[in-house]
């Protein structure tokens, strides 16, 4: 922490302007009133401060702002966002898309992404909900930020907003994230005839249950197979080959690169070597022909 | 070792079909998809489709898709194309590639020597 | 479909040259390029697999590049026995494309 001094009378403070840049960092934290700092926060991102100089602000506001900052201040932070911790973010509360943007804007190129996370998570609790003018700053400003979200956040998206999102916008998604958005998206594009549902639904896809991956099967989509290859494990074992091969159509020619990873290995093992032979491919590790199998889990949850 | 071989060259009328043959040696016939190819005189390679060599399912050039059938004769390990409807942009010679499957969908290692189709009434 | 455009479509250069061809995506596939020679009255080829990946038997001179939609052929030094059609395949969609073809001739 800095050492607390007494500020010399021709270093005292009545605005914050460049001349500030020459302060040593005891005479910042000297000379500096905090809530003239915090009325004049928009000032302070066009001065040239050091990192060491920045530091003293922050200080400052947090001195002042215990409990969070308040958002005109947050509004204003520029670069000072920089040294904000996810502890700090945690303490706002911030509703203003205007300050969402600002701080997006600075935190491009610095690796930010917990601070950011923190940030877009303090907004929608903010906001009420994940709504889509937010959801449209995240898209525009931040892709990929969506996300970052928790599962619990993103069941706040109205399935109407679904459609703002794009492709590029879940590439970094888990599947519990997808588990969350994907009836949202079934939901919002169930009027939207088969080709057309596809396309739109695909990158949800992560998140389908199996009679889902099935049904799409019997409607000629064609997956291409980085699509098959994020879908739920538990939604693919349960397929035949049959299906398989109906729902990939020419893209069933890929399975052989992926032979050996997950999901398509695990699926592999379920299958009778029999039925994985008509796929012309020379898939091995199937079911042996004459063998019997007996799921042990059936009877286990009876007895 | 790896072959392809093709049937002969042949020629057309306009109207007529023509199938070419492709005998595959040297691998498990199973175990790889079948592409064609063609090549029309002094022009590029054009992907015509390709044919599931287990149980005959095939998938085509959306270009080609009304005057072309890909079959294969497992007994035989014989891949066939034949088009139908001749015209004289049809004048090419045909091959058929054998893809490996060492990343995506798989490039073309093998091919046939090529069958010339000349299409002239 | 993808479409594949493959320029120059024909060029000449002397013995000892660098040559180079380049060949456009239509859309992002990732490193699923390959390359091929063809000589007159003979099949294609394969000299390059995942954008640049030699196969083997091919000479060092040849070389390939790029990701996403742009990649680039290289002769470093252009050979006698070189004087062929080249020839870039996309196999990131089943439905697989060529490039237009670039035609290599000796100054």
């Known amino acids: 922490d800095v050492e607390r001094t007494t500020c010399p009378p021709e270093k005292e403070v009545h605005e914050i302007d460049e001349s500030l840049i020459f302060y040593k960092k005891r005479e910042l934290e000297a000379c500096v009133d905090a809530a003239l700092l915090a009325a004049q926060m928009d000032r302070v991102d066009a001065i040239p401060f050091t990192y060491e100089q920045l530091d003293v602000l922050k200080h400052k506001l947090d001195e002042l702002y215990p409990q969070g900052y308040p958002e005109s201040v947050i509004r204003h932070l520029g670069h000072l966002f920089l040294k904000m911790s996810p502890e700090d973010i945690r303490k706002w509360n911030v509703t203003s898309l205007e300050t969402l943007k600002a701080l997006l804007k600075v935190s491009k190129g610095h690796e930010m992404s917990a601070q950011v996370a923190t940030l877009i998570d303090r907004v929608v609790v903010g906001r009420g909900q994940l709504d889509k003018d937010t959801v449209d700053t995240l898209t525009a400003f931040c892709p990929g930020c969506l996300c970052s979200l928790s599962p619990e956040r993103l069941s706040s998206v109205p399935p109407s907003v679904i459609g703002a999102v794009r492709p590029q916008d879940l590439d970094t998604c888990g599947p519990r994230q997808l588990d969350v958005l994907y009836p949202k998206a079934r939901l919002a594009f169930q009027n939207m005839s088969g080709s057309e549902y596809f396309v739109k639904i695909r990158p949800f896809l992560g998140g389908a249950p199996t009679e889902d991956v099935k049904a799409l099967s019997q409607q000629n989509v064609s997956m291409d197979l980085a699509t098959f290859m994020k879908l739920r494990r538990e939604a693919v074992l349960p397929l035949t080959v049959a299906e398989v091969q109906k729902l990939l159509g020419p893209h069933v020619e890929g399975l052989k690169v992926e032979e050996q990873h997950s999901p398509v290995r695990d699926w592999i093992l379920k299958q009778r070597q029999d039925d994985l032979d008509t796929l012309g491919l020379g898939l091995q590790g199937g079911i042996p022909n004459g063998y019997l199998i007996l799921d042990l889990s059936v009877r286990e949850a009876l007895s | 070792e790896v072959q392809l071989v093709q049937s002969g060259a042949e020629v057309k009328k306009p109207g007529a079909s023509v199938k070419v043959s492709c005998k595959a040696s040297?691998?498990?016939?199973?175990?790889?998809?079948m592409h064609w190819v063609r090549q029309a005189p002094g022009q590029g390679l054009e992907w015509m489709g390709n044919?599931?060599?287990?149980?005959?399912?095939?998938y085509y050039n959306e270009r080609f898709r009304s005057r072309v059938t890909m079959t294969v004769d497992k007994s035989t390990s014989t891949a066939y194309m034949e088009l139908s409807s001749l015209r004289s942009e049809d004048t090419a010679v045909y091959y058929c590639?054998?893809?490996?499957?060492?990343?995506?969908?798989?490039?073309?290692?093998?091919w046939g020597q090529g069958t010339t189709v000349t299409v002239s009434s | 479909d993808i479409q594949m455009t493959q320029s120059p479509s024909s060029l000449s250069a002397s013995v000892g040259d660098r040559v180079t061809i380049t060949c456009k995506a239509s859309?992002?596939?990732?490193?699923?390029i390959a390359w091929y020679q063809q000589k007159p009255g003979k099949a294609p080829k394969l000299l390059i697999h995942?954008?640049?990946e030699l196969q083997p038997g091919v000479p060092s001179r040849f070389s390939g590049s790029g990701s996403g939609t742009d990649f680039t052929f290289t002769i470093s030094s252009l050979q006698p026995e070189d004087i062929a059609t080249y020839y870039c395949?996309?196999?990131?969609?089943?439905?697989?494309?060529f490039g237009g073809g670039t035609k290599v001739e000796i100054k």
């Open positions: 590639a054998r893809p490996y499957y060492g990343s995506s969908y798989g490039y073309f290692d093998y």
């Open positions: 040297g691998y498990t016939f199973t175990n790889y998809w």
């Open positions: 044919i599931n060599p287990s149980q005959g399912g095939p």
């Open positions: 859309q992002d596939i990732n490193k699923y």
């Open positions: 995942y954008t640049s």
């Open positions: 395949l996309q196999y990131a969609n089943p439905l697989r494309t």
